[in-house]
């Protein structure tokens, strides 16, 4: 999907109001200095997509983030402001359909998700630099 | 200390398809950071070709999307390049480098392909 | 495409002396900015990212600095080992990461 055409302010919007909260609240007991950020992005649409494949595609050290509440409402976010994104998730949903039950978070889960939270700051950042 | 190797054909043919390997060793690429290709034609400047980050997310130049292809081997912590349709222009000192997706903080010592018939 | 011009394209100095070395942007790259420098028959080393900090490793002697469109890399008195080409590299326009053409320094 290309994240050119979304409303980057609303997504801004979105993110400070309500999937920040939930990224920390993951994250809660852990520090900032915990985990050493190693991926970032260049511009708006770049850290878009990928905050989409981090959220959403499983990784072997942690199976599946896309059942949590932070990436529930970053799909509702992107489906919103994204035109014809929620169109291109079908296997997404599976993703999440398939996802362990089980509530166990993982220090390499808590690893990915301090990624993602260096991946929506920069996003953020991007956003101000640019108004 | 990560360490990156590149091996594959020094010669192709014109029109066929280009293919390295990158092996890595002293860091998992299914961990952390991404994994990227950047040539660099003799006597010339350099040039990105793409990336693949450790949780499968890829990036291509546009200029070469048509024909690349970037794959990974987290078994054999290996990551793949693939450029078809190659012609003389396509000769180049090939990189894998280490990247934050951003720019390439660790590379491999390079390996020269030539197109020729 | 951003496209990165690089001047001089070859700069002639000797062991101790100041180098200055320039890199400009054909449209704002904000701080997304690297520089490299490469040896003859080696790979480029990442000396400076986000156009003003160090890579690890990289001795104190090599800064960056500027913003937007123009950019220097300084090399505050010159070792035997830094005459190498030096290369300037964009990321602010994902996909499309471009260099420099390169500047040479050599000796004088």
């Known amino acids: 999907y290309d994240f050119t055409n979304c409303d980057f302010q609303k997504i801004e919007a979105d993110y400070l109001r309500t999937i920040s909260k939930d990224l920390i609240t993951y994250m809660s007991g852990t520090k900032s200095t915990d985990f050493n950020n190693t991926v970032s992005c260049s511009n708006r649409p770049h850290c878009l997509t990928e905050i989409q494949s981090l959220t959403f595609n499983p990784t072997p050290r942690c199976a599946s983030l896309a059942k949590e509440m932070f990436a529930r409402k970053t799909k509702a976010t992107l489906a919103l402001w994204c035109p014809g994104y929620s169109e291109t998730q079908i296997n997404a949903t599976q993703a999440m359909k398939k996802a362990r039950k089980s509530k166990v978070t993982t220090n390499k889960c808590l690893e990915q998700v301090s990624q993602l939270l260096g991946l929506w700051r920069r996003f953020i950042r991007t956003l101000l630099k640019k108004q | 200390q990560v360490q990156l190797q590149e091996s594959g054909p020094g010669l192709v043919k014109p029109s066929e398809t280009l293919s390295l390997t990158c092996t890595v060793s002293?860091?998992?690429?299914?961990?952390?950071?991404?994994w990227s290709w950047i040539r660099q034609p003799p006597g010339k400047g350099l040039e990105w070709i793409g990336y693949?980050?450790?949780?499968?997310?890829?990036s291509y130049n546009p200029s070469l999307k048509s024909r690349v292809t970037i794959s990974r081997d987290t078994s054999k912590n290996q990551f793949s390049l693939k450029l078809s349709s190659v012609t003389a222009a396509d000769t180049a000192v090939y990189y894998c480098?280490?990247?934050?997706?951003?720019?390439?903080?660790?590379w491999g010592q390079g390996t020269l392909v030539t197109v020729s018939s | 495409e951003i496209v990165m011009t690089q001047s001089p394209a070859t700069l002639s100095l000797s062991p101790g002396e100041r180098a200055t070395l320039s890199c400009r942007a054909s449209?704002?790259?904000?701080?997304?900015l690297a520089w490299y420098q490469q040896k003859p028959g080696q790979a480029p080393r990442l000396l400076i990212y986000d156009a003003s900090s160090r890579a690890t490793g990289i001795p104190a002697r090599f800064s960056g600095s500027g913003s937007g469109t123009d950019f220097t890399l300084t090399i505050s008195s010159l070792e035997p080992e830094d005459f190498a080409v030096y290369y300037c590299q964009q990321y602010s326009d994902w996909p499309q990461y471009t260099f420099g053409q390169g500047t040479k320094v050599e000796i004088k």
């Open positions: 449209q704002s790259v904000s701080n997304n």
């Open positions: 693949i980050s450790y949780y499968g997310s890829i």
């Open positions: 480098a280490r990247t934050n997706l951003l720019y390439f903080d660790s």
């Open positions: 002293g860091y998992s690429i299914s961990s952390g950071y991404g």
